[in-house]
């Protein structure tokens, strides 16, 4: 008789999850000399220990503490790039501008990027069939708690001028319910962060509107100002040219507005 299994509303654990995490860890530590001392088997054991045999709706930050410890990494606090709903361009940017970091450029972010995982209460099995959906099932699921934990601490680490890339093609350019809007904005430390600079990325070639005047951007400005942090905003009209100019800043066409 097959054992009854909880059916969740979200997709199950990513195929070959253990192998993927381990392989990513090995790759990351090979690329980043300062992380070469990291024992990837221990990292996987700590990751696994955060959710295996635990009810996938009852995960806490505390469950991830052993993983946080093993993933300790110094991020230059004035080189942090946050993003919301525009991950690919943010990552393309930091691949070119190597001294800036998104969360996914850190070991912990790199390990978990685009992956889903969950276990089952009282069994050592990984659930590859389904995992809790944040809205339909529960918010304290393994994936959501992980990202909330690392996102909060990443924002807390930031100082001086913090940049955030926002998607100008979306109806809500700044979304209070995104990780950026619900976690990172509220955990920037006013005594360390002088300015939050938003880069609003335009989608259409012919889009010449000033999206910095969008009501949701004004809402972001209001939230940030109330936290005694300055706010500035820039339109990036041509993201392709923007990336090109990051690669080749001497290019004569890069003096004009991007």
């Amino acid at each position: 008789v097959p054992r009854w299994r909880q059916q969740w509303s979200g997709p199950g654990t990513t195929k070959r999850f253990p192998e993927t995490v381990l392989a990513r860890c090995v790759k990351y530590t090979e690329i980043h000399p300062e992380m070469r001392h990291v024992d990837c088997q221990s990292v996987w054991d700590a990751f696994k220990g955060a959710f295996i045999s635990k009810h996938p709706c009852n995960i806490t930050e505390e469950d991830y503490q052993p993983l946080m410890k093993l993933g300790t990494q110094t991020v230059p606090c004035n080189k942090i790039l946050l993003w919301s709903r525009i991950k690919d361009l943010a990552h393309q940017f930091t691949q070119v501008q190597r001294d800036m970091f998104t969360l996914e450029d850190t070991l912990l972010g790199y390990l978990a990027d685009d992956l889903t995982w969950c276990g089952e209460f009282n069994t050592s099995k990984i659930n590859y069939q389904s995992c809790p959906d944040w809205r339909k099932d529960c918010s304290n699921n393994p994936v959501s708690v992980f990202w909330k934990t690392v996102s909060r601490r990443f924002a807390e680490a930031a100082c001086d001028v913090v940049h955030v890339m926002l998607n100008g093609s979306r109806s809500k350019i700044f979304d209070k319910n995104s990780t950026f809007g619900s976690v990172e904005v509220h955990n920037l430390q006013p005594e360390k962060v002088q300015t939050l600079e938003a880069w609003v990325i335009h989608g259409g070639r012919e889009d010449s509107r000033d999206l910095c005047q969008d009501p949701t951007i004004k809402e972001l400005e209001s939230i940030i100002s109330k936290r005694n942090i300055q706010f500035s905003c820039k339109n990036i009209y041509r993201p392709d040219k923007f990336l090109q100019c990051v690669k080749n800043p001497e290019d004569s066409s890069c003096t004009s507005e991007i």
Partner: antibody, heavy 120, light 107 residues
């Protein structure tokens, strides 16, 4: 603003006990590992102990192992150091310091220190 | 335990001088090194983290370099407020260990 304030120092006889406190304010206490560092009069800095953000993992310098116990109460935003079997060589200013995990391997905020004198 | 050795133990310098303090680790610690400044009767203050990153609010005359076992703290133009004791600290492994300190005095 962000602050760490130590208290509980004083004069104690050899073999005696003392409990130091470090009250944190102005930041999310549970995001930080907390450390005790001491400095004997006219000497350099000596790391004493640390505790992780949940309080489940601790570590001690060999010089205090078995005698000192670090703990924290996250509901009170307070760090503690219970010092037993005190010796003359434990005389020092004791500082608490915070370390953001996992994105900061450094102590960016320190308390003002509290002096512990072990003498008969 | 990883031993941290600073040199010199003390130095005398004048305002405007370029000052260099070195720190050597007993084993490879990659870039897991911090520098702190301490003035008499005060708590230490973080200057440099991760060997070369300037802490927010610290003047740009301070800089750090090095990797592996040998590290340097440089003050490009010494100011009156820079007379203090400087400590390096490794956080590659527990226990965290500090150098013995370098006292920068007025010549």
């Amino acid at each position: 603003q962000v602050q760490l304030v130590e208290s509980g120092g004083g004069l104690v006889q050899p073999g005696g006990s003392l409990r130091l406190s470090c009250a944190a304010s102005g930041f999310t206490f549970t995001s930080y590992y907390m450390h005790w560092v001491r400095q004997a009069p006219g000497k350099g800095l000596e790391w004493v102990s640390y505790i992780d953000s949940s309080g489940s993992s601790t570590y001690y310098a060999d010089s205090v192992k078995g005698r000192f116990t670090i703990s924290r109460d996250n509901s009170k935003n307070t760090l503690y150091l219970q010092m037993n079997s005190l010796r003359a060589e434990d005389t020092a200013v004791y500082y608490c310091a915070r370390q953001l995990m996992p994105f900061g391997g450094y102590f960016d905020v320190w308390g003002q220190g509290t002096l512990v004198t072990v003498s008969s | 335990d990883i031993q941290m050795t600073q040199s010199p133990s003390s130095l005398s310098a004048s305002v405007g001088d370029r000052v260099t303090i070195t720190c050597r680790a007993s084993q490879n610690i990659s870039q897991w090194l911090n520098w702190y400044q301490q003035k008499p009767g005060k708590a230490p203050k973080l200057l440099i983290y991760g060997a070369s990153n300037l802490q927010s609010g610290v003047p740009s005359r301070f800089s750090g370099s090095g990797s592996g076992t040998d590290f340097t703290l440089t003050i490009s133009s010494l100011q009156p407020e820079d007379f203090a004791t400087y400590y390096c600290q490794q956080y590659y492994d527990l226990p965290n260990t500090f150098g013995q300190g370098t006292k920068v005095e007025i010549k």
